[in-house]
């Protein structure tokens, strides 16, 4: 884990949030875990951050991620009137100035330091499931989701006819 107080780091004014002048609808500081209750953790190694999927020891503190929620037009909007075809997008930031990014070439999920406005690779379309889990679809590559592969986060292609409830792309958000 980062060894910093996530809550303290995030008391600054709504994470100075604005994307191209648009403020998020809301922000939510939460721990992120897999469908099978493994924790997503972040560690500084060789001057870069690594993302791990691991079982935490009893009483070990979970890392927190700041989710910022934005409203955006859905690309397949047919009506063109701006009313229909909205979607919720999120950015995920485990510490100041660092955001999860989709690296579509490498099919990987990486932490990058960047300034605003954030690139499209930092935005994920939020899906919430009947299991009350969520999944994160790449804005830059529809049908590709953040998932778990070999104890790491990776980008996973989900066939459109498949059930989005494939366990390896489901995550739980928790305030604790």
């Amino acid at each position: 884990a980062f060894g910093i107080s996530g809550v303290q780091k995030y008391t600054r004014a709504l994470h100075d949030s604005s994307i191209t002048g648009i403020s998020p609808i809301t922000e939510y500081l939460a721990s992120l875990s897999t469908y099978n209750d493994q924790s997503i953790t972040f560690a500084l190694e060789d001057e870069s951050y690594e993302i791990y999927v691991e079982d935490l020891k009893k009483d070990e503190k979970k890392d927190k991620v700041l989710l910022s929620y934005y409203e955006s037009q859905h690309p397949s909007n047919e009506s063109g009137d701006g009313v229909d075809g909205k979607m919720l997008m999120v950015t995920l930031s485990p510490t100041k100035d660092f955001w999860l990014h989709a690296n579509n070439k490498e099919h990987s999920v990486e932490l990058h330091k960047c300034e605003k406005p954030l690139p499209d690779q930092a935005f994920f379309v939020l899906h919430n499931m009947h299991s009350n889990c969520v999944s994160f679809e790449c804005k830059t590559d529809p049908g590709v989701f953040i998932g778990v592969k070999d104890n790491h986060l990776a980008l996973i292609k989900v066939d459109s006819s498949e059930n989005l409830c494939t366990e390896n792309i489901l995550f739980k958000l928790s305030e604790t």
């Epitope: 909205k86 979607m87 899906h127 059930n163």
Partner: antibody, heavy 122, light 107 residues
Framework: EVLLQQSGPELVKPGASVKISCNAS????????MNWVKQSHGKSLESIGD????????FYNQNFKDKATLTIDKSSSTVYMELRSLTSEDTAMYYC???????????????WGQGTLVTVAA | DIQMNQSPSSLSASLGDTITITCHAS??????LSWYQQKAGNNPKLLIY???KLHTGVPSRFTGSGSGTLFTLTISSLQPEDIATYYC?????????FGSGTNLELK
């Protein structure tokens, strides 16, 4: 223009079944789950469940697991709800409704059908 | 299931009044609360989503606020066309649940 057009009113006998429909137009049908909501006369709204047009995956509110079955006909962009073993308690207006956000229930229901009144009487 | 406790169940007000309806969620739903207006014999209409975002075409006299577990819908300068029943609904968690409704009538 997004339209959810529901089938007409039904008068059915206790113990029988009824199948009502909701035809969607004006948007990409497969992009949004279709939800069903019950409203008994003078009462509040109650979510029955929903169906995913991409794959037919269904979710039912626990209270309706043994009462409702949702199905889909992708070719006509129509969703069906069958209600079985009907009793007077099932007499209500039934609405189909579509979420505001693609992929998410967080924004509530932005489009509603006009409702189908189901009356259960001997 | 998340319970949505809405109050008052009925409300009498005069034209031009400001009225407030409250919705209390049994657990934290962040801002994922919607408000609907339903006139007699009609289907519900979305007024406000994400607790405070006004849906397209809804008059600005309707305002929503709150987050977490406590939410309010305020109608300022009540108009004759506002006479209806109002419902809150949480979208955070399945099954999706509604408040019991507030019937607004003219004094």
């Amino acid at each position: 223009e997004v339209l959810l057009q529901q089938s007409g009113p039904e008068l059915v006998k206790p113990g029988a079944s009824v199948k009502i429909s909701c035809n969607a137009s004006g948007y990409t049908f497969s992009d949004y789950n279709m939800n069903w909501v019950k409203q008994s006369h003078g009462k509040s709204l109650e979510s029955i469940g929903d169906i995913n047009p991409k794959n037919g995956d269904t979710f039912y509110n626990q209270n309706f697991k043994d009462k409702a079955t949702l199905t889909i006909d992708k070719s006509s962009s129509t969703v069906y709800m069958e209600l079985r073993s009907l009793t007077s308690e099932d007499t209500a207006m039934y609405y189909c409704a579509r979420h505001y956000y693609y992929g998410s229930s967080y924004g509530g229901f932005v489009y509603w059908g006009q409702g189908t009144l189901v009356t259960v009487a001997a | 299931d998340i319970q949505m406790n809405q109050s008052p169940s009925s409300l009498s007000a005069s034209l031009g009044d400001t009225i407030t309806i409250t919705c209390h969620a049994s657990q934290n739903i962040n801002v994922w609360l919607s408000w609907y207006q339903q006139k007699a014999g009609n289907n519900p209409k979305l007024l406000i989503y994400a607790a405070s975002k006004l849906h397209t075409g809804v008059p600005s006299r309707f305002t929503g606020s709150g987050s977490g577990t406590l939410f309010t819908l305020t109608i300022s300068s009540l108009q004759p066309e506002d006479i209806a029943t109002y419902y809150c609904q949480q979208g955070q968690s399945y099954p999706l649940t509604f408040g019991s409704g507030t019937n607004l009538e003219l004094k």
